[in-house]
């Protein structure tokens, strides 16, 4: 009878993570008597996967009944495959012996490759907000995929971006891989409602790419424009001055009125109106009792937005000659939270 050969018919097997891998092995003869063992890898550091004779291998099942003498099919199934299971598996025939069985012949090996899906891409933006016209960086990360080939694209509001750099690690062979990409995005005043999208395509996703998003509302700061105007006289000795704070984002804003450089009132933006582009408008007004002033008054609307250095706009209030009335030093009644009398 011809000498036993160990046949592993599959040079490679590709399995999706979580599925079962079947590793095929047959012998051409029933002699010599002795067990079959399966190993991952070769040489002294090889890892025992299954031993026909003894041991507990909960993930491994045999395709046929290996207890029988007449069996020549030593194929096994390995359940719940993970990327860590990738490698070359050898079916090895031993000859019965003492004190140990003697390795007799090995199969040529079957390379198990594991297809593992990438994790959901995580997009993160800069730690601090930035203003329009500035360029900010976004990063996208996805992990645990195999094989290594992967495609990553960036979009802003559906428009593909071109200014990005991508790395897949590690460079050499590995059981699974990670991708890291950094994209540069120029902010505009209209970006409060904008989204940056990182899209990852991989063979395991069957043409349905994974997406990670970042809202530019978390990144952008649109500084306000200020306009101070004097309204028509409400009463003979009162002037209404308004400060229009327009097109700002985020909402966090504090406004201080100064009269000739002295703090008159400070308030926080509360009842704001939202523009279509996502920015906010707010208005504060001041009721000025001009009869209390002999000289012109410089009114300043000072705004501190989102913890940034204050910006201000001033208005010179002309005090024309007029008779001083009795009780002019008496405070006029406040008619609203945004009103202030100066006397």
């Amino acid at each position: 009878e011809e000498e036993l050969q160990v046949i592993q018919p599959d040079k490679s097997v590709l399995v999706a993570a979580g599925e079962t891998a079947t590793l095929r092995c047959t012998a051409t003869s029933l002699i010599p008597v002795g067990p079959i063992q399966w190993f991952r890898g070769a040489g002294p550091g090889r890892e025992l996967i299954y031993n026909q004779k003894e041991g507990h291998f909960p993930r491994v099942t045999t395709v046929s009944d290996l207890t029988k003498r007449n069996n020549m099919d030593f194929s096994i199934r390995i359940g719940n495959i993970t990327p860590a299971d990738a490698g070359t598996y050898y079916c090895v025939k031993f000859r019965k012996g003492s004190p140990d069985d003697v390795e007799f012949k090995s199969g040529a090996g079957t390379e198990l490759s594991v297809r593992a899906k990438p994790s959901a891409p995580v997009v993160s933006g800069p730690a601090a907000r930035a203003t329009p016209q500035h360029t900010v960086s976004f990063t996208c990360e996805s992990h645990g995929f195999s094989p290594r080939d992967i495609t990553l694209k960036w979009f802003k509001n559906g428009n593909e971006l071109s200014d990005f750099q991508t790395n897949v690690d590690p460079v050499g062979e590995s059981v699974s891989y990670s991708i890291h990409s950094t994209a540069k995005v120029v902010l505009t005043r209209e970006d409060v409602h904008s989204q940056v999208i990182c899209e990852v395509a991989h063979v395991t996703l069957q043409g349905d790419p994974l997406r990670g998003t970042a809202n530019l509302s978390e990144t952008i700061r649109v500084p306000p424009t200020l306009e101070v105007t004097q309204q028509p006289v409400r009463a003979e000795n009162q002037v209404n001055v308004t400060c229009q704070v327009r097109k700002f984002y985020p909402q966090r804003l504090q406004l201080t009125w100064l009269e000739n450089g002295n703090v008159s009132r400070t308030e926080t933006a509360s009842t704001v109106t939202e523009n279509k582009d996502g920015t906010y408008n707010w208005m504060s007004w001041l009721l000025v009792n001009v009869s209390a002033h002999r000289d012109d008054v410089k009114l300043t609307c000072q705004v501190e937005h989102d913890g940034q250095p204050a910006v201000s706009k001033s208005h010179d209030l002309k005090v024309s000659a007029h008779p001083k009335e009795q009780g002019s030093n008496t405070a006029a009644e406040n008619t609203g939270s945004n009103e202030r009398n100066i006397y």
Epitope: E1, V33, S98, P99
Partner: antibody, heavy 118, light 107 residues
């Protein structure tokens, strides 16, 4: 049903010959090593001989040169030709199948009695 | 030849008892050890192979352990049908050899 049935035992004079047969059924006979084991009255078991799948043979020292094991796969039959019989060969002879992957015996026949006496 | 020595030669026990029979080989036999049960006038019955693997159809009250030269057969809860003679056998190399047997008797 897997079965082994021995036959051919009997009374024989010292120096005589006897041929034992073992008829196998219920399995692919050619795929198994087959053994003969004997048991003397009131004594323990003694392995006698084996014939492998490829026809290779081995014998216990006490029977070497006197006994010959053979098989006929087409008939699913195992044989033991016993020559130059001695009184010490008196025993119940069993055939057994090396049915496990490691050639452990899994199936035994019911036995046939061989008596060597003058 | 490899010598197989069983102990004890005989053992008295009661129904429900747990009993252990030991078998020692004169040299390392890896774990190629089998156990057989034989009742008077009957052929031996295979119980265990490769030290601890149960033959098909053998109840799990029988268990085997050991390696190298020292082996044991344990019957966890004796039933009337378990009173018999038990043999160990090495089959790592020819000639295969048996122990002299342990007769398990009812107390």
């Amino acid at each position: 049903e897997v079965q082994l049935v021995e036959s051919g035992g009997g009374l024989v004079q010292p120096g005589g010959s006897l041929r034992l047969s073992c008829a196998a059924s219920g399995f692919t006979f050619s795929s198994y090593d087959m053994h003969w084991v004997r048991q003397t009255t009131g004594k323990g078991l003694e392995w006698v001989s084996v014939i492998g799948i490829a026809g290779d043979t081995y014998y216990a020292g006490s029977v070497k040169g006197r006994f010959t094991i053979s098989r006929e796969n087409a008939k699913s039959s195992l044989y033991l030709q016993m020559n130059s019989l001695r009184a010490g060969d008196t025993a119940v002879y069993y055939c057994a199948r090396g049915g496990n992957w490691d050639d452990a015996f899994d199936i035994w026949g019911q036995g046939t009695m061989v008596t060597v006496s003058s | 030849d490899i010598q197989m020595t069983q102990s004890p030669s005989s053992l008295s026990a009661s129904v429900g008892d747990r009993v252990t029979i030991t078998c020692r080989a004169s040299q390392d036999i890896n774990n190629y050890l089998a156990w057989f049960q034989q009742k008077p006038g009957k052929a031996p019955k295979s119980l265990i192979y490769t030290t601890s693997s149960l033959q098909s159809g053998v109840p799990s009250k029988f268990s085997g352990s050991g390696s190298g030269t020292d082996f044991t057969l344990t019957i966890s809860s004796l039933q009337p049908e378990d009173f018999a003679t038990y043999y160990c056998q090495q089959y790592v190399s020819y000639p295969y050899t048996f122990g002299q047997g342990t007769k398990l008797e009812i107390k």
